[in-house]
Amino acid sequence: GALEVQVPEDPVVALVGTDATLCCSFSPEPGFSLAQLNLIWQLTDTKQLVHSFAEGQDQGSAYANRTALFPDLLAQGNASLRLQRVRVADEGSFTCFVSIRDFGSAAVSLQVAAPYSKPSMTLEPNKDLRPGDTVTITCSSYQGYPEAEVFWQDGQGVPLTGNVTTSQMANEQGLFDVHSILRVVLGANGTYSCLVRNPVLQQDAHSSVTITPQRSPTGAVEVQVPEDPVVALVGTDATLRCSFSPEPGFSLAQLNLIWQLTDTKQLVHSFTEGRDQGSAYANRTALFPDLLAQGNASLRLQRVRVADEGSFTCFVSIRDFGSAAVSLQVAAPYSKPSMTLEPNKDLRPGDTVTITCSSYRGYPEAEVFWQDGQGVPLTGNVTTSQMANEQGLFDVHSVLRVVLGANGTYSCLVRNPVLQQDAHGSVTITGQPMTFPPEA
């Protein structure tokens, strides 16, 4: 008969830039050897070869050298494929073909996602506003995938649907920048909120602007930065937003713009003497030169590292002087936990087993929760350790010691507190003598 190949029913959701595991398994017969295995991963639609194992050896990646098998697990029937540094273009269906004597196949869907940045809000005009003025509020959120849903509401939570224009443009990597424009007539004062929703991640990013019509005070330069920390994934680029309102007649030669680390006063980037003086921070920063004249003093920080986390101060001088600090919160998603059992054979009710849940390369430190099959939290006999690697990313290992009942399911949830990302794994142990992982 046909070989039974098992893959997850639901799409595998992977964040851009992270690694994804496309799970595929089969049940080897007694006496199975890897020399008998013929394993092919293909793109379902185009039939393009992705990775193969044949003639007793891994034939390697045929997909931009970004795929790998799990060679130590193949003999147990684990034909899963690791796809590294996921891109938008990877989205779609992958088919896992397994032949030993018989043949079987199954397709697994990869859904790519990228969180949208906290929206930045701009106002035009942004000075000397009075009740009755018509203003254009622009809500911009960047580098997300797939296309976002955008919602506006006023300070009372009433949806604003009229006079809204939303555009979404994909960059070279396929990530979308969303710009939504609301035109509104000012009342005495008002709060306007914009919510950008990622439909796959069910991630909502929102910002609001409160407008109190009045004359702007003169004197110090008003420097505006986001109130909330800017959250950036390790390895991606982050924009630290900073803006000011240039006076009529402003020229870039008048601008003195300094970005510093708030605590150490270390210079990060500067624009002085009419020109960009460049990055003083490992050549990983850039301004937006075409936008400076409009008052956009934002800083682009490339290839974010854990060590970048902290507060950055934007100092702006034209004639007057102003400054504001913006916080960078670095994050990295935790991998789907792997579960191991010790002992893992001939288990019987009453045995004490150690279940280890391991999740890798996340930041900041994770929160780990255990529960049984009924959803009851398990807090006793849990030991969790987290260790940072050279890049500052954490590997988390949580160990649960439990006495087996007739049967039971044990779930481990690893939560990234910044991304509000939950990664979970579970193991089900049945009452009869068994081996883990199950052979059928």
Epitope: P248, S251, Q254, N256, G274, F315, S317, R319, F321, S323
Partner: antibody, heavy 116, light 107 residues
């Protein structure tokens, strides 16, 4: 009312270093104000020398950049100018001023002569 | 750098009359121009900034006009204390530069 007062030696040897201090009084805060030096050669026009920001960041005239240093001492509410390798061409009245771009508050100026 | 040229070098006008001083920039400085008055033994005094905005405490007989490369300082009715040297200064491009001055003397 903001007051600025320059002080320093009136005579400097050629190839020596000119050092001037500007004392600030009357409520100007060095943590929010820029400070500027301007000079005026005898019978000549005004020349902008350089400026220092509230966080100690400096910009200098291209023609003087290699020889000039401006610094600020916040605790003493004063800022200073150093000009090295001076020649007779550096003989001038040196003014300190508050702010940048254009200047509403000036010191009364101090004449520095470069001569042996 | 931008060169500021003032004309005339010396202007002789009688008290009570109007004086018109000119300043030309070697390239556009938008409206980023200031005018100063300097008397012997004194520091310059800011009169006008933004080409036409009077500084605090400056009498309204002083007015500035122009944009781009051509600017004018007008003193509508000269008083005795107005006889001095006048400088224009641009702050549109780096570095800041001053004109060579116009001496306003009593006719």
């Amino acid at each position: 009312q903001v007051q600025l007062q320059e002080s320093g030696p009136g005579l400097v040897q050629p190839s020596g270093t000119l050092s001037l201090t500007c004392a600030v009084s009357g409520g100007s805060d060095s943590s929010t104000n820029w400070w500027t030096w301007v000079r005026q050669s005898p019978g000549q026009g005004l020349e902008w020398i350089g400026e220092i920001s509230p966080i100690g960041f400096t910009s200098y005239s291209p023609s003087l950049r290699s020889r000039v240093t401006i610094s600020v001492d916040k605790s003493k509410t004063q800022f200073s100018l150093k000009l090295s390798s001076v020649t007779a061409a550096d003989t001038a009245v040196y003014y300190c001023a508050r702010d940048r771009l254009y200047f509403a508050f000036w010191g009364q100026g101090t004449l520095v002569t470069v001569s042996s | 750098e931008i060169v500021m040229t003032q004309s005339p070098a010396t202007l002789s006008v009688s008290p009570g009359e109007r004086a018109t001083l000119s300043c030309r920039a070697s390239q556009s400085v938008s409206s980023n121009l200031a005018w100063y008055q300097q008397k012997p033994g004194q520091a310059p005094r800011l009169l006008i900034y933004g080409a036409s905005t009077r500084a605090t405490g400056i009498p309204d007989r002083f007015s500035g006009s122009g944009s781009g490369t051509e600017f004018t300082l007008t003193i509508s009715s000269l008083e005795s204390e107005d006889f001095a040297v006048y400088y224009c200064q641009q702050y549109n491009n780096w570095p800041i530069t001053f004109g060579q001055g116009t001496r306003l003397e009593i006719k």
